[in-house]
Amino acid sequence: EEELQMIQPEKLLLVTVGKTATLHCTVTSLLPVGPVLWFRGVGPGRELIYNQKEGHFPRVTTVSDLTKRNNMDFSIRISSITPADVGTYYCVKFRKGSPENVEFKSGPGTEMALGAKPSAPVVLGPAARTTPEHTVSFTCESHGFSPRDITLKWFKNGNELSDFQTNVDPTGQSVAYSIRSTARVVLDPWDVRSQVICEVAHVTLQGDPLRGTANLSEAIRVPPTLEVTQQPMRVGNQVNVTCQVRKFYPQSLQLTWSENGNVCQRETASTLTENKDGTYNWTSWFLVNISDQRDDVVLTCQVKHDGQLAVSKRLALEVTVHQKDQSSDATP
């Protein structure tokens, strides 16, 4: 005669409040004759969860028909799960006896725990922008999950980051937990189009992790490089001077021209172009009138980028004798 085994396949069963939980239990033998009862907990304080023969268990139904002669499946379903239902559930075989049945063998137990999904991770970057080569911190938070075990990873453009610190609170027993992680990211000049991703994996997500993202464009400031050049060609009695402001981010930029220290109010032509890496180039043209009275013309292109201190580039205008003569010829 085969020895009876009580099989409870799941060690842990995660359930959600309000849902129905299925607790599995199968037996390997029909002998000895006697009922299978379900309990929660062990020892004298264990609670009777289901007894097919007697009692009223409105939230419990059986998966199989227990009245069938060769039934070996004693699994049950518990509906409308509440936090009060957590605990370890045991299916226990009793041997028919007189006047009362006697406990014969217990299953290993299935721990029922409340599973709550983590909230969508929220990633927050630094309050102020920082220039490349510097380190910035990003925080990721997710709340309301249970059980406590959770995995959090950081990525930058698909590459996993290692410089981060994670905390799960509270440390003791709780209905729900929160995770907070801070990652340190070194900014590269091309990071305007980069993204950091916080990825949270939890048993309730069935292998489909949640992600929160932040764009490094919100955290980075790429300062411009300036170049002021004089065009070799002139237009009538005017010389064209160009100020090229290259590779800056964000777009916020103020450009002013000064002639011998005097700010010029007049309109200048300009163009803004976007580079592949997300930075911008700004080109401004300034036309200077050439006359023989003007020997030393110093032009200054001053740029104020994203509220930072102004940077400027100067150019001493080179006016050849030939140009002066032409200018004089052109002046009435």
Partner: antibody, heavy 122, light 107 residues
Framework: EVQFQQSGTVLARPGTSVKMSCKAS????????MHWVKQGPGQGLQWIGA????????TYNQKFKGKAELTVVTSTSTAYMEVSSLTNEDSAVYYC???????????????WGQGTLVTVSA | DIQMTQSPSSLSASLGERVSLTCRAS??????LNWLQQEPDGTIKRLIY???SLDSGVPKRFSGSRSGSDYSLTISGLESEDFVDYYC?????????FGGGTKLEIN
């Protein structure tokens, strides 16, 4: 009628052990946990532990682990408790009582033995 | 462990008087509380189970109730045999714990 008959008064020397008994009658012995409770002179009640005759499963109050040992003989429906390394602190009346094989409100500590008085003295 | 704080530890009352004994649980025990009576010869008898259910054979003058974590045993008209010791017991969580007891004395 359910009854618990406990063994008689014991006078014991410090450092020795005593083993007392509690014989149950009037119901199925194997359907109940047998509990033991201590009451020191002029003191309150303290739960020591319990044993389940079906599989000799025991549960103890941490304070009495290593001090008390619970056993049963199902054929005679008798529960035993041995108290070892006796000191004056162990002088008390020891009661047996029972609860059902699961937590059934109506069955918790309904019936009590008359108690066994243990006096520890040199 | 769950602490059961019983009060008062002793109480003097007169025949026919109504008295209440209280036990306060340090943690949630639901309704899993018994009231026990102990005679001077040591005999222990259960009076109330599950906070308010009266055991068979126990006079109706005994009643049990609950308010939050406070559990009460009320004797509505004291009789001479009631002047003994009373204990509460929680059976919600192991180790099962008793209140310190109340000695009811005749005035």
């Amino acid at each position: 009628e359910v009854q618990f008959q406990q063994s008689g008064t014991v006078l014991a020397r410090p450092g020795t052990s005593v083993k007392m008994s509690c014989k149950a009658s009037g119901s199925t012995f194997t359907s109940y946990w047998m509990h033991w409770v201590k009451q020191g002179p002029g003191q309150g009640l303290q739960w020591i532990g319990a044993i389940y005759p079906v599989n000799n499963d025991t549960t103890y109050n941490q304070k009495f682990k290593g001090k008390a040992e619970l056993t049963v003989v199902t054929s005679t429906s008798t529960a035993y408790m041995e108290v070892s390394s006796l000191t004056n602190e162990d002088s008390a009346v020891y009661y047996c009582t029972r609860s059902f094989y699961y937590s059934l409100d109506a069955a918790w500590f309904v019936y009590w033995g008359q108690g066994t008085l243990v006096t520890v003295s040199a | 462990d769950i602490q059961m704080t019983q009060s008062p530890s002793s109480l003097s009352a007169s025949l026919g008087e109504r008295v209440s004994l209280t036990c306060r649980a340090s943690q949630d025990i639901g309704s899993r509380l018994n009231w026990l009576q102990q005679e001077p010869d040591g005999t222990i008898k259960r009076l109330i189970y599950a906070t308010s259910s009266l055991d068979s054979g126990v006079p109706k003058r005994f009643s049990g109730s609950r308010s939050g974590s406070d559990y009460s045993l009320t004797i509505s008209g004291l009789e001479s045999e009631d002047f003994v010791d009373y204990y509460c017991l929680q059976y919600a969580s192991s180790p099962f714990t008793f209140g310190g007891g109340t000695k009811l004395e005749i005035n």
